[in-house]
């Protein structure tokens, strides 16, 4: 007995081979040997089974001794022994369908979990495996398991559903809900203007939410709530916002904020939030901000930074074209009584410059 | 083609009301953001008002705010702003503008429709 | 709201030379402005969007450009129906706001 694998919703094509190339009658029967479908010389009937109206045959072929079965819009229950009856001749077909589908919405948020459930007919033993866009493979039977979503999952997993050495492939777009960056860094000097911009990893034609940014910065004893704001089909509506600082958001995508100017007191991390209509969860992306101030008091040249820095970054003051003064891993550097010229402070990660400041001294009369 | 035609400007003295409208034809109206866009005699330009696609949200420059209402009829196609408590800084000529679908600029404005306020 | 500085308010020169209107922003507003041209008794007409997007139907003499929160209209040899005055708009955020326009007139 010949086996066919079907995916729930396609069409299949089940063959019929006359040895005479050319029209004879024939018919299409279920295992209970219901019609489903013949010919009467060049005419194609149909029985009372349950696929009637979407079961057909292509009469282009008959000519040459081929009697299909095309069964449109496959149902899990039409899985079942098909039989052709031609030339005293009974050809038995047993059609398996299958079906496979993400027993949640097929857009999840970043750490949510992903179920796929197979549909098999009765009797049924299958084995099912799937390449994630990432190329992990997860295998299963009845129901496969993703748990932790990573922006990396987006895109198309690959199903392969196993049956009598027969296979058969699905293919389901999965959209992970995610900013771009969990994280991100902006180093400024004082008085600088300061851009946040916050992309998403997808793109949905019609994308509505809320959102706000929390921000904690270090000299303060607890975080603060700096805007609150409402997407609707893209565009950004600020609902609330601090007035110090003086904040301005932008009223399209990516979400994106401006500060005037970076000062030490704004110095700390931010959580932005959004959350999506008919999801739950948010999604949250994490965002830093340095200040660096240089200043010359007196006979004491101070070069500080504020906001979190690794222990690993560098604050050097050195003498242009000169050698480091001093180089410490430490937020505060000074230099008594410094010569005359133009001085820069530097941040700096392992050689490359993060972040830096000018400060011209001028000679002492 | 896109147009915008402007109407219900005229004359009214200090404290009076008007309302204009904006009927436009060629687009689906829910899509676009709109505003209303005013020049004084020998001035330059001066955003006024803004309405969302959705017609949710509403915006305002501070010279008009609690005075002037925006509101947009998707079913009529037309943009209306009504003027309240008009000064005679509000004489103007308005324009009403409509917004790109992925873009926020102007691209398409009427002819404008002529406000003055006088005693 | 964000205040656009425009400069300079007026301009005189011949036609074929090459001129350039300034815009600065008070805060960043990314790429969000556009470049209008109006003429007396006529609706502005957008010419530049996105800082530097040549709008449909424009003549590519027409050019824009950003740095940080500066922005500049670029006419690289300006024709006679080119005089005109030329307006900013921020569409970055709510409240809108224009430059105080530039007008160009022939020497």
């Known amino acids: 007995k010949k086996v066919v694998l079907g995916k729930k919703g396609d069409t299949v094509e089940l063959t019929c081979t006359a040895s005479q190339k050319k029209s004879i009658q024939f018919h299409w029967k279920n295992s209970n040997q219901i019609k489903i479908l013949g010919n009467q010389g060049s005419f194609l009937t149909k029985g009372p089974s349950k696929l009637n109206d979407r079961a057909d045959s292509r009469r282009s072929l008959w000519d040459q001794g081929n009697f299909p079965l095309i069964i449109k819009n496959l149902k899990i229950e039409d899985s079942d022994t098909y039989i052709c009856e031609v030339e005293d001749q009974k050809e038995e077909v047993q059609l398996l369908v299958f079906g496979l589908t993400a027993n949640s919405d097929t857009h999840l948020l970043q750490g949510q979990s992903l179920t796929l459930t197979l549909e098999s007919p009765p009797g049924s033993s299958p084995s099912v495996q799937c390449r994630s866009p990432r190329g992990k493979n997860i295998q299963g039977g009845k129901t496969l398991s993703v748990s932790q979503l990573e922006l990396q999952d987006s895109g198309t997993w690959t199903c392969t559903v196993l049956q009598n050495q027969k296979k058969v492939e699905f293919k389901i777009d999965i959209v992970v809900l995610a900013f771009q960056k969990a994280s991100s860094i902006v180093y400024k000097k004082e008085g600088e203007q300061v851009e946040f911009s916050f992309p998403l990893a997808f793109t949905v034609e019609k994308l509505t939410g809320s959102g706000e940014l929390w921000w904690q910065a270090e000299r303060a004893s607890s975080s603060k709530s700096w805007i609150t704001f409402d997407l609707k089909n893209k565009e950004v509506s600020v609902k609330w916002v601090t007035q110090d600082p003086k904040l301005q958001m932008g009223k399209k995508l990516p979400l994106h904020l401006t500060l005037p100017q970076a000062l030490p007191q704004y110095a700390g991390s931010g959580n932005l939030t959004l959350a999506l209509e008919a999801k739950t969860g948010k999604l949250h992306q994490e965002v830093n901000l340095v200040v660096m101030r240089a200043t010359q008091l007196q006979k004491n040249l101070t070069c500080e930074v504020w906001g979190p820095t690794s222990p690993k970054l560098m604050l050097s003051l050195k003498l242009e074209n000169k050698e480091a003064k001093v180089s410490k891993r430490e937020k505060a550097v000074w230099v008594l009584n410094p010569e005359a010229g133009m001085w820069q402070c530097l941040l700096s990660d392992s050689g490359q410059v993060l972040l830096e400041s000018n400060i011209k001294v001028l000679p002492t009369w | 083609e896109v147009e915008l035609l402007e109407s219900g400007g005229g004359l009214v003295q200090p404290g009076g009301s008007l309302r204009l409208s904006c009927a436009a034809s060629?687009?689906?109206?829910?899509?676009?953001?709109m505003s209303w866009v005013r020049q004084a005699p020998g001035k330059g330009l001066e955003w006024v008002s803004g309405?969302?696609?959705?017609?949710?949200?509403?915006y305002y420059a501070d010279s008009v705010k609690g005075r002037f209402t925006i509101t947009s009829d998707n079913s009529k196609n037309t943009l209306y702003l009504q003027m309240n408590s008009l000064r005679a800084e509000d004489t103007a000529v308005y324009y009403c503008?409509?917004?790109?679908?992925?873009?926020?600029?102007?691209?398409?404005w009427g002819k404008g429709t002529t406000v003055t306020v006088s005693s | 709201a964000i205040q656009m500085t425009q400069s300079p308010s007026s301009l005189s020169a011949s036609v074929g030379d090459r001129v350039t209107i300034t815009c600065r922003a008070s805060?960043?507003?990314?790429?969000?402005l556009g470049w209008y041209q109006q003429k007396p008794g006529k609706a502005p007409k957008v010419l530049i969007y996105?800082?530097?997007s040549l709008q449909s139907g424009v003549p590519s003499r027409f050019s824009g450009s950003r740095s940080g929160t500066d922005f500049t209209l670029t006419i690289s040899s300006l024709q006679p129906e080119d005089f005109a005055t030329y307006y900013c708009l921020q569409d970055y955020t709510y409240p809108y706001t224009f430059g105080q326009g530039t007008k160009l007139e022939i020497k």
């Open positions: 309405i969302s696609g959705s017609g949710e949200n509403t």
């Open positions: 503008a409509k917004e790109g679908y992925n873009w926020n600029y102007m691209d398409v």
């Open positions: 805060h960043g507003i990314r790429n969000d």
């Open positions: 060629g687009l689906t109206f829910s899509t676009f953001a």
């Open positions: 996105e800082a530097s």
